[in-house]
Amino acid sequence: MERRRITSAARRSYVSSGEMMVGGLAPGRRLGPGTRLSLARMPPPLPTRVDFSLAGALNAGFKETRASERAEMMELNDRFASYIEKVRFLEQQNKALAAELNQLRAKEPTKLADVYQAELRELRLRLDQLTANSARLEVERDNLAQDLATVRQKLQDETNLRLEAENNLAAYRQEADEATLARLDLERKIESLEEEIRFLRKIHEEEVRELQEQLARQQVHVELDVAKPDLTAALKEIRTQYEAMASSNMHEAEEWYRSKFADLTDAAARNAELLRQAKHEANDYRRQLQSLTCDLESLRGTNESLERQMREQEERHVREAASYQEALARLEEEGQSLKDEMARHLQEYQDLLNVKLALDIEIATYRKLLEGEENRITIPVQTFSNLQIRETSLDTKSVSEGHLKRNIVVKTVEMRDGEVIKESKQEHKDVM
């Protein structure tokens, strides 16, 4: 942590970017009859950042503080006025007390100054403690941020794993779908072949029936022909002729039937062969189908196990994500409480600085009263510029690399009976 020594006025400009009079005195505020103290406007401070999300809330706090400071300053002014009355009273007895005053100047600072010095030491000590505490809290915050990053990374890794598993599953599903489509296609092809067999059977049945009908018709015709010859003696010769003819016709018919039947048998054999081939093909397809079904079943098994694995992985992931979420919530709570604590410390710190500033001004006032001169009260520049306190920046990032620069202008006006007798300006540059 970088330490800086800054004056009370500079400290104000570090905390807030608003215009601020030294000690919160409004310009032109009367210190007493014949005397007025004013300070020139300070240049705006360098851009600053307070690295907290609560900065906005604190800003409102600072505004309230400024208001209370103004009230305190008004009260102090009133006290100044009463002190000046006392000084006037002392002026009347100036000669009597001059020696005593000289004696007091020569001496060590009063016991009152010692008391304030002791208080200041105590305040500085508290400030140092707060600074150390703030540094420790920052380290803790960094550690928490690191833990959070680790948890987030772990969560990301788990998510990646899950996505990978899902992609694998999608690929397996696609393979299973393709196998199913192949099986369905094969089934359709087998059914197509079986359909052809059904038609072939029908065609075969019809051909056989047709041939049987033809055969039956021919037999009736032959029987009629055979029954024709007349048995009368007169036609014996004709009968023998007819018998010879009938005999040869019978042979021809038989021959014709035989050849026709042979054709039929051939056709039947051909059809039977076609049927056998079709059945053989169907069996081949069935075998292929069985093997494909086996493949499909094994794929289904793989698929199911993968789905089971994925479910388990998802459950595990959900559980882990829940625990991460809890841890995250816990960390965020802790972070929030740390932020609140930091804000509290910052507030305390601010209050202490306010008290300290008030004390600084009061000490300066007392010192001036003790060093009071005969005709007027003037406040040398050194009084304010030498009042130095220690302060530690809460966040090194929030102070820019360049030095803080400010001008303090002390304007001294001497008035008598409402008229300005003497006016002087002194400019003091501070570089941090």
């Epitope: 296609d185 359709r188 092809k189 197509s192 359909e195 052809e196 059904r198 072939l200 059977r201």
Partner: antibody, heavy 115, light 112 residues
Amino acid sequence: EVQLVESGGGLVKPGGSLKLSCAASGFTFSAYGMHWVRQAPEKGLEWIAYISSGSSTIYYADTVKGRFTISRDNAKNTLFLQMTSLRSEDTAMYYCASSYALDYWGQGTSVTVSS
Amino acid sequence: DVVMTQTPLSLPVSLGDQASISCRSSQSLVYSNGNTYLHWYLQKPGQSPKLLIYKVSNRFSGVPDRFSGSGSGTDFTLKISRVEAEDLGVYFCSQSTHVPYTFGSGTKLEIK
């Protein structure tokens, strides 16, 4: 996507002829048997003809036997139905359909036989 | 030829109701390989028929699960668990066990 698109229908006089076509796509046409089915106006469906994948087996309904001829060109993925000696009772919407379950049908082509 | 008889011819329903259509064949539709080639189609006005259920109870691709088929031998049923507006049209049953293939006369599903 399986698609069957019939064409060739129209108005014809009794005794006249028409040749219907059915263009197939989206499946292995040469692997499946194909059918023609018709539907007379406001009537039911009537199966009329079958041809096997390799054209070796052909079968017709009795109502069209001897008048209609089914054929296919596997190289062109096309099914045909040559209709001759058309009668008024042949007036119908003609659909081609694939496979034993008639799983895919075309949108149909209308044939009107009228003098 | 196998005759397919569908009942009822018309089925008025309210949207969200269950609907049931029956189909009876003149012969058993169980083929020698054990399969039963009974299918259900829906034809919406001005469109071609679309396959819903094949081989008694298998839903065709893209068909909602509110459609289900059941039955065996010669008696079959198509059920729609909750009728939606898009389900309105004419439902046909068909058999491809026996050649020639034959269709039922159709059942018109309409709003009550």
